[in-house]
């Protein structure tokens, strides 16, 4: 049978033949007549026989993490039969290790994200090395992993390459650190091989800090006549933390004439003072308010360092701007009685310069042939009014401010023209009647009715009555209604066409005004011919009589 | 802290311009929302606020004596002034500069103020 | 402009006592846009109250300020020595103006 021990051979060596070992057959008695054969991968190029005596050498150097054992066969002849003295048989050679290979880390690179402000123990991340040298002879790969930079901050276990947080840090003072793991095989002997990598560790940032302004005290300036919501400044905090960390809300702290509000611009993080309430600078030409800022989002447990806001004070300076004059009234009402003579005065009317400065007023009518005004506004009449032509006169009153002519404002300006009476009634149409000749006495021949241009206090009341003329001659008569109407009646039996075919009565209308004022008003009255039946045989105004519905007898 | 001292002619003739400067030390007159006025006092009565200036330049006046006041400022020195022009008996008094505060337009440094008599 | 008035004009008090300064401006103004200032003979004044109750830096605390509208005191709760002196208010809002004054002396 063969003889063989278990073959080693140590890798990495220099030598030019190494000898390995011995392979046998028990019955070779050392005579030269056997011949041992090396077959298999490696043979002849990285093991050689001894083919008389069966010794192996190793005649290149071998790399154990390359390839850790050969299996090879072996074969022993007769050289005198030519013939196999034992069966092929299949040997193992092992290389062994040497500690030549350092660690390596094989996932790099390495990076992690960590809070900020994380406590002690905090895993960060954990780093592993690779030892290509045999785990299992000795303390070859055998690992321990240590920190050359990260201190005071990281740790790492030595045996399981965890980093830790071992101090807590501020992303605001400092967002990442370079941590340098080192990685010892031979468990740190001496002899030891290293290898290191980087690990680089990125500060995630939490909201523990709250926006500051920038200043502490701002000026803004404001045009009295800028309308509510104008952007009137913008105001700047600062927050040392990132992205939602930063989102920040202004707002008023104080602000006792609750003029201004600032709203958030939230994507330039700005506070936009605006306008709420208009100002005026004659009113309150200097505003102070107090603003504060707050993180949009802070958690619960962040609370600690947001108990305070942060503010900051806003001058707020009106600036002035010329505005036209203002009067006292937005308009008014003047009463003037009729038929006063020109150069009468109607009322006054006042503007002034709301400005500080106070320029004197001119003022002006629009388009009046009849009114006037002077330079302290008073009104006069530049004609005698008629309440029977103009009742009302709407004027528009214009004041200029004398420093600047731009600066205008107009109000209107009602005047009533009041009546007095100077009008007497007078018939309200004109009336022709008729009469028929055969006519009884007490016969009614036209009701009549007045009008007045005078307007009425209370209710006109009209008087009505003959002439003093008419009332002697005695043919007609009339009697008043007492409502403002009068009839006239034949005062006689019997007239006569061809010898009065027309009569003119001459009548009296007077008013209840004071004084009283009469009219004398003409009637004519038409003499016709009737039938007995009442129809008119002659009479040219027969059919509008008629149609009037009187009726001859 | 900021402390403000004033200078000029202690007399000046009627009709004249009264000119008045302001040196600020402690502080910059440039400093962000302050502003820096003239105030003064006639002999044995109250305070009477002439105007004040920014340190862009930015002045107001009191009203009555709006056409008679000129405010400036000088930055690079760290100064401001005041021109009082056509100047009466009435203009005698002691005149004060001062900056307003950190959270008002009250006044909250003076300067020591100096007596301008109006006289021939 | 607005007018303040101040009163009395002169108010004649023994040190320990409290005494009670008025002011009353001719229109409303905001809480916020008065002061009150001390001046001793031959100073320039020295800013007390602000706003109108906030002292300002190094003002003990025996001044105090209050009101609204029109009307607003400076109290002094126990007068001392160097107390009896001249007092102003001024109001910051419609441009600047002070009050005559209100001379507090030693009865």
């Known amino acids: 049978g063969w003889v063989w021990n278990q073959f080693f051979v140590p890798e990495e060596m220099n030598t030019t033949s190494h000898h390995v070992g011995r392979l046998r057959s028990d019955l070779d008695n050392g005579n030269n007549s056997f011949q041992y054969k090396l077959l298999g991968a490696g043979a002849g190029s990285t093991f050689i026989i001894d083919e008389r005596t069966g010794d192996i050498y190793a005649i290149e150097k071998l790399d154990r993490e390359e390839r850790s054992l050969y299996i090879l066969r072996a074969q022993v002849i007769d050289i005198t039969t030519g013939r196999a003295v034992e069966p092929e048989s299949e040997f193992v050679i092992k290389v062994s290790d040497i500690n030549d290979n350092e660690p390596k880390f094989l996932d790099e690179p390495y990076e992690a994200i960590v809070p900020e402000m994380s406590p002690e123990g905090t895993l960060v991340i954990q780093v592993t090395a690779s030892d290509a040298d045999d785990p299992s002879s000795g303390n070859n790969a055998r690992l321990l992993y240590s920190l050359l930079q990260g201190q005071p901050y990281f740790s790492v276990e030595p045996t399981t390459g965890v980093i830790r947080i071992s101090s807590k840090m501020d992303r605001e003072l400092q967002d990442e650190y370079w941590v340098i793991i080192q990685a010892k095989d031979m468990i740190g002997q001496p002899g030891a091989l290293s290898g290191t990598t980087s690990v680089l560790i990125k500060l995630s940032d939490v909201n523990d800090n709250k926006p500051i302004f920038k200043e502490s005290l701002y000026r803004l300036t404001v045009s009295e006549s800028a309308p509510t919501g104008t952007s009137i400044g913008t105001i700047m905090a600062y927050d040392n933390d990132i992205g939602e960390n930063a989102e920040m809300d202004y707002s008023i702290e104080e602000d006792d004439s609750q003029t201004f509000d600032i709203i958030t611009n939230h994507e330039t993080q700005e506070g936009i003072v605006i306008l709420k309430k208009k100002v005026n600078f004659e009113h309150q030409n200097h505003y102070g308010i107090r603003a504060k800022v707050k993180n949009h989002h802070v958690d619960e447990q962040l609370m600690k360092y947001h108990t305070e806001a942060s503010t900051t004070f806003i001058k707020i300076q009106v600036e002035d701007v010329d505005e036209p004059p203002l009067f006292l009234l937005p308009y008014y009402i003047f009463e003037i009685f009729e038929e006063t003579p020109q150069g009468s005065f109607v009322g006054v009317v006042s503007a002034t310069d709301p400005d500080n400065r106070k320029s004197p007023i001119r003022y002006s009518i629009t388009r009046s042939k009849v009114f006037n005004i002077d330079d302290n506004g008073t009104i006069t009449t530049t004609n005698s009014l008629d309440r029977e032509i103009s009742a009302w006169y709407n004027l528009s009153i214009t004041a200029t401010e004398k420093y600047n002519i731009e600066q205008i404002s107009s109000i209107p300006v009602y005047v009533q023209v009041l009546n007095i009476n100077d009008h007497a009634p007078e018939f309200s149409q004109y009336y022709e009647s008729y009469v028929c000749e055969n006519a009884g006495s007490g016969q009614v021949i036209q009701t009549i009715s007045a009008v007045d241009r005078d307007e009425s206090i209370e209710e006109h009341h009209f008087y009505f009555n003959l002439s003093v003329e008419d009332t002697n001659s005695s043919s007609f008569t009339i009697i008043d209604n007492q409502d403002n109407t009068a009839v006239i009646l034949t005062n006689r039996t019997g007239f006569n066409l061809q010898e009065e075919p027309i009569f003119y009565i001459s009548i009296l209308i007077a008013d209840n005004g004071i004084p009283s004022l009469t009219s004398t008003n003409t009637l004519t009255i038409h003499v016709c011919d009737c039938d007995d039946s009442g129809s008119t045989q002659t009479c040219q105004y027969q059919e509008l009589m008629l149609s009037m519905g009187f009726k001859t007898e | 802290q900021v402390q403000l001292q004033e200078s000029g002619p202690g007399l000046v003739k009627p009709s004249q311009t009264l000119s008045l400067t302001c040196t600020v030390s402690?502080?910059?007159?440039?400093?962000?929302?302050?502003?820096w006025s003239w105030i003064r006092q006639h002999p044995g009565k109250g305070l009477e606020w002439i105007g004040y200036i920014y340190y862009t330049g930015s002045a107001y006046y009191n009203p009555s004596l709006k056409s008679r006041v000129t405010i400036s400022v000088d930055t690079s020195k760290n100064q401001f002034s005041l021109k009082l022009s056509s100047v009466t008996a009435a203009d005698t008094a002691v005149y004060y500069c001062?900056?307003?505060?950190?959270?008002?337009?009250?006044?909250?440094?003076w300067g020591q103020g100096t007596l301008v008599t109006v006289s021939s | 402009e607005i007018v303040l008035t101040q009163s009395p004009g002169t108010l004649s008090l023994s040190p320990g006592e409290r005494a009670t300064l008025s002011c009353r401006a001719s229109?409303?103004?905001?809480?916020?846009?008065l002061a009150w200032y001390q001046q001793k003979p031959g100073q320039a004044p020295r800013l007390l109250i602000y706003g109108p109750s906030s002292r300002a830096t190094g003002i003990p605390d025996r001044f105090s300020g209050s009101g609204s509208g029109t009307d607003f005191t400076l109290t002094i709760s126990r007068l001392e020595p160097e107390d009896f002196t001249v007092y102003y208010c001024?109001?910051?809002?419609?441009?600047?103006?002070f009050g005559p004054g209100t001379k507090v002396d030693i009865k």
């Open positions: 229109r409303n103004i905001s809480s916020s846009y």
């Open positions: 001062a900056r307003d505060g950190s959270s008002g337009w009250y006044f909250q440094y």
């Open positions: 001024q109001q910051y809002g419609s441009s600047f103006t």
């Open positions: 402690g502080g910059s007159i440039s400093s962000s929302g302050y502003y």
